[in-house]
Amino acid sequence: EAHKSEIAHRYNDLGEQHFKGLVLIAFSQYLQKCSYDEHAKLVQEVTDFAKTCVADESAANCDKSLHTLFGDKLCAIPNLRENYGELADCCTKQEPERNECFLQHKDDNPSLPPFERPEAEAMCTSFKENPTTFMGHYLHEVARRHPYFYAPELLYYAEQYNEILTQCCAEADKESCLTPKLDGVKEKALVSSVRQRMKCSSMQKFGERAFKAWAVARLSQTFPNADFAEITKLATDLTKVNKECCHGDLLECADDRAELAKYMCENQATISSKLQTCCDKPLLKKAHCLSEVEHDTMPADLPAIAADFVEDQEVCKNYAEAKDVFLGTFLYEYSRRHPDYSVSLLLRLAKKYEATLEKCCAEANPPACYGTVLAEFQPLVEEPKNLVKTNCDLYEKLGEYGFQNAILVRYTQKAPQVSTPTLVEAARNLGRVGTKCCTLPEDQRLPCVEDYLSAILNRVCLLHEKTPVSEHVTKCCSGSLVERRPCFSALTVDETYVPKEFKAETFTFHSDICTLPEKEKQIKKQTALAELVKHKPKATAEQLKTVMDDFAQFLDTCCKAADKDTCFSTEGPNLVTRCKDALA
């Protein structure tokens, strides 16, 4: 239904707290360099204006679209051109082009320092002094570093943060209470960020149809007792919510997500038997819980699908009459039978089925042509299953750090032109798949591994798009989203690469490494490992292990030495010489 004032409508629906949080996220995601104070001032102005519209929907400018109102605010910021360069050109455009322009200038890798967590006492002091400002800072800092973070979900993480601080700041040992809990929230939020970025990439590159197919597969796996009409309705609504968030329409997105959660809870009987626990929670927790609710129990006696999709004489007729509905039904029926497959795999199977029908329904004898289509799925299914087995076996043998190193070597060989920081970040993230997925029950491993890897590789593609350097990466990133992971897995050593010359300074370390936290030490060592592979792309695993063991021993010795600086300056060059010899 149309409202006289869109801003008043959203303010009323969302309430002041969520309204302000979402506006802050929107501004922080669009203008990523502005300070918290600058954004907080804008948010207050927008909120005050919204309140005037709530009081009188006919007041001046209350009928303007949210894009117009927000865009005008952003464009009124002083020194926009000095701070943001060509993004200022967006302000010369009219809506909707202006908003599209802002979206195109979102930076997936902004040059901002890492978000450092203050020490416990300082955190608790500022939290107690002003919880609202403290949470505002959290939203601002996360949103500007993750310009596609799912806004209503970021409000959920802020709420978690708030609850942890409320609990831990009352304890004697604040540090040991806060650290593990906040680390847990950070890890979950980072995974949420890459997953959502993947959804927005799907929407941006391949449109709503691609996202809706993803949603049908995912929802059919989770709700195998819901009928196709119900799954289609949920997928359509979920597509709208994600389209809005990916498009910067955060107030609409959060409002529609709340509506979808309400609908699901009012229709549990036709959706799933597992929703009640989620539905008993308050809004943000409820929507989060529904998004990762456990799969409902599969129906006991689902028949094979060959009868409807291969053996039926009307297959081509049914397909021709309503292609998307027929393919949607196929995807639904296949997915509800296979919660043990990744969504990416299910979409590859549906794509293969579609390609087969396109080809066969144009032939003289279609049934003879498409009769073997389901059997032809076997290699597509076996490939990711083998990937999971091989990688989980390796993870179990090496542990997380060793597994990351194995991936780092593999990916540096595949794409040695990619910058070392990007390779290290990618390998560390890809390596976490072991800890995240390999400990799960067998039927949950494949969906966990492949869908997580796909999301991480999407980030690799986004970073590479900014500065394309590797033909291998460009090739894998240009294809369809669901083919990316198999494409990257199939890459081998890049034979076109001319090895980097050996630079001693790349492998020269100083005593300051000794005081770094363990994570930073690992990154330094992994940076050296990637550089070694760039110098010798065809080095064997044994050679690289020898060098890395020697390197670890060197760090251990010098960091324990009485005179660390002398140890580093005398033993360092010897290490470099030994490395060169080992790789010769």
Epitope: T297, M298, L302, A304, H338, L374, Q378
Partner: nanobody, 115 residues
Framework: QVQLVESGGGLVQPGGSLRLSCSAS????????MGWYRQAPGKQRELVAS???????HYADTVKGRFTISRDNSKNMVYLQMNSLRAEDTAVYYC?????????WGQGTQVTVSS
């Protein structure tokens, strides 16, 4: 060609136990359902127990608490442990394994419960 072979049937006294096994030979992949059905003389074939790919189990009301279905994924095997057997459990028991492409049935194994 996929073949299913059931074993473990036989004659047992009321209150006794049997363990049925079913093994699949040939290339069957992408299994999403394994089940045991039974057919008593003059009656329709009925589902006794099934186990889906996610590990969910389903039992007919008449066997709940007495029968347990389990599987060994690596060997494509499915088992039915039957305890506290009754005369009305007498039937031919069939194993059924399903993937999206088809429904594969064994020849059946006779279970007779009689004193």
């Amino acid at each position: 060609q996929v073949q299913l072979v059931e074993s473990g049937g036989g004659l047992v006294q009321p209150g006794g136990s049997l363990r049925l096994s079913c093994s699949a030979s040939g290339s069957i992949w992408g299994i999403y359902h394994m089940g045991w059905y039974r057919q008593a003389p003059g009656k329709q074939r009925e589902l006794v127990a099934s186990i889906t790919v996610d590990g969910s189990t389903h039992y007919a009301d008449t066997v709940k608490g007495r029968f347990t279905i389990s599987r060994d994924n690596s060997k494509n095997m499915v088992y039915l442990q039957m305890n506290s057997l009754r005369a009305e459990d007498t039937a031919v028991y069939y194993c059924d394994i399903r993937n999206v492409g088809g429904d594969y049935w064994g020849q059946g194994t006779q279970v007779t419960v009689s004193s």
